[in-house]
């Protein structure tokens, strides 16, 4: 069995994690996908898509949202309003059985610390910060629009986007990530 190297990422409370990973659509388009947290050596399924998966239809479980794009082999995971207790090891997987899931990319070691969510989260060896202030319009907007979104791009092995409450973070792995919002 190939040992997957875990990727460590650090965020502030209140930020949002968005992971976009891809899969072999020929094999897994109709499979259920799941977002799981490792507790000890056992994974705990936090959310899973329906089967058959309807294109893009969001599945929401508490603060977690899954979106599956089976025609293109994409799965998007979002965890909003991160809390210190969310820290841990996570995996994006093809859900076959609670004890038998296919991991789509390296496990994510998520570290959430207290502090201002307006500051960038960090990833080891990050190389770039890009800021974007989400739009404000005449109508009332939710908390997503109250402070800048931050993007942190890591070296070629991974890419992280760090954001403020309600906006998104993209975590990319060499073969697995879909897109990284970058705003100038």
């Amino acid at each position: 069995t190939t040992e997957l190297t875990e990727e460590k990422y650090e965020y502030k409370e209140g930020q949002t994690l968005e992971v976009k990973c891809d899969y072999a659509l020929e094999k897994y388009a109709n499979s259920r996908k799941a977002w799981q947290k490792m507790e000890g050596k056992m994974p705990k399924i936090l959310a899973k898509t329906e089967r058959p998966s309807e294109n893009s239809h969001p599945v929401q479980v508490g603060r977690i949202t899954l979106e599956d794009y089976p025609d293109h082999g994409l799965l998007q995971v979002r965890m909003t309003n991160l809390q210190v207790e969310d820290s841990g090891l996570y995996q994006c997987v093809i859900y076959q059985h609670p004890k038998e899931s296919h991991v789509l990319f390296n496990p994510i070691c998520l570290v959430v610390t207290k502090g201002s969510s307006g500051t960038p989260g960090s990833s080891e060896n990050s190389t770039q910060n890009v800021y974007r202030t989400p739009s404000t319009t005449a109508k009332a907007l939710g908390p997503r629009y109250t402070s800048p979104r931050t993007v942190t791009q890591a070296p070629p092995e991974s890419t992280v986007v760090v954001s403020t409450p309600g906006s998104e973070i993209n975590l990319t792995n060499v073969t697995d990530i879909i897109r990284v919002p970058v705003f100038n």
Epitope: N55, G73, L74, G166, V180, F183
Partner: antibody, heavy 117, light 107 residues
């Protein structure tokens, strides 16, 4: 069959307003992020704005921030773009497009907006 | 924003020719690049996504390759209906940005 049909374009004076609509059919509209993309005459394509499935998030290209507002009515399978304080440089064909995670996979036929005095 | 530079801006070719269009990103975008075909007065049509995956219904004479910053769209044997303008789109960094287009004309 997926269909996106834009309407609402026309001739408007600088500083004026216009509201574009996009009627969607053939797919579960409420399950997708949607975007507006524009193309000035003889020019290339430019993403303008997008909106999340439930309307809770919206983003804009810098040049239209504070002037344009994207919205949607999932009950009516409709996408909208309210354009205020229009400028000559906003003259373009405006397309609504479905965001499929790594591309815009379906587009409408476009509606022409001309800003001129 | 990530800048996308297409080359050439136009190319003259004959039916049956092999045509190659390139797109270069101002920073690495991994494989998150799409290619579109647009004919005058028509909306763009998705040909390729994720750099090399062929969109359903698109003829196999179209192919894409590349990753990182350099990408290529190849039409293996040009057909009369392929004369059009082609655009690349990067979907790695938001806002998504397009290349300036490559017009494929009849020689």
């Amino acid at each position: 069959e997926v269909q996106l049909v834009e309407s609402g374009g026309g001739l408007v004076q600088p500083g004026g307003s216009l509201r574009l609509s996009c009627a969607a059919s053939g797919f579960t509209f409420s399950s997708y992020w949607m975007s507006w993309v524009r193309q000035a005459p003889g020019k290339g394509l430019e993403w303008v704005a997008n909106i999340k499935q439930d309307g809770s998030e919206e983003y804009y290209v810098d040049s239209v921030k504070g002037r344009f507002t994207i919205s949607r009515d999932n009950a009516k399978n409709s996408l909208f773009l309210q354009m205020n304080s229009l400028r000559a440089e906003d003259t373009a064909v405006y397309y609504c497009a479905r965001d499929y995670g790594d591309s815009f996979d379906y587009w409408g036929q476009g509606t022409l907006v001309t800003v001129s005095s | 924003d990530i800048q996308m530079t297409q080359s050439p801006s136009s190319v003259s070719a004959s039916v049956g020719d092999r045509v190659t269009i390139t797109c270069r990103a101002s920073q690495g975008i991994r494989k998150w690049l799409a290619w579109y075909q647009q004919k005058p007065g028509r909306a763009p049509k998705l040909l390729i996504y994720a750099a090399s995956r062929l969109q359903s219904g698109v003829p196999s004479r179209f192919s894409g390759s590349g990753s990182g910053t350099d990408f290529t769209l190849t039409i293996s044997s040009l057909r009369p209906e392929d004369f059009a303008t082609y655009y690349c789109l990067q979907a790695h960094g938001f806002p998504w940005t397009f290349g300036q287009g490559t017009k494929v004309e009849i020689k």
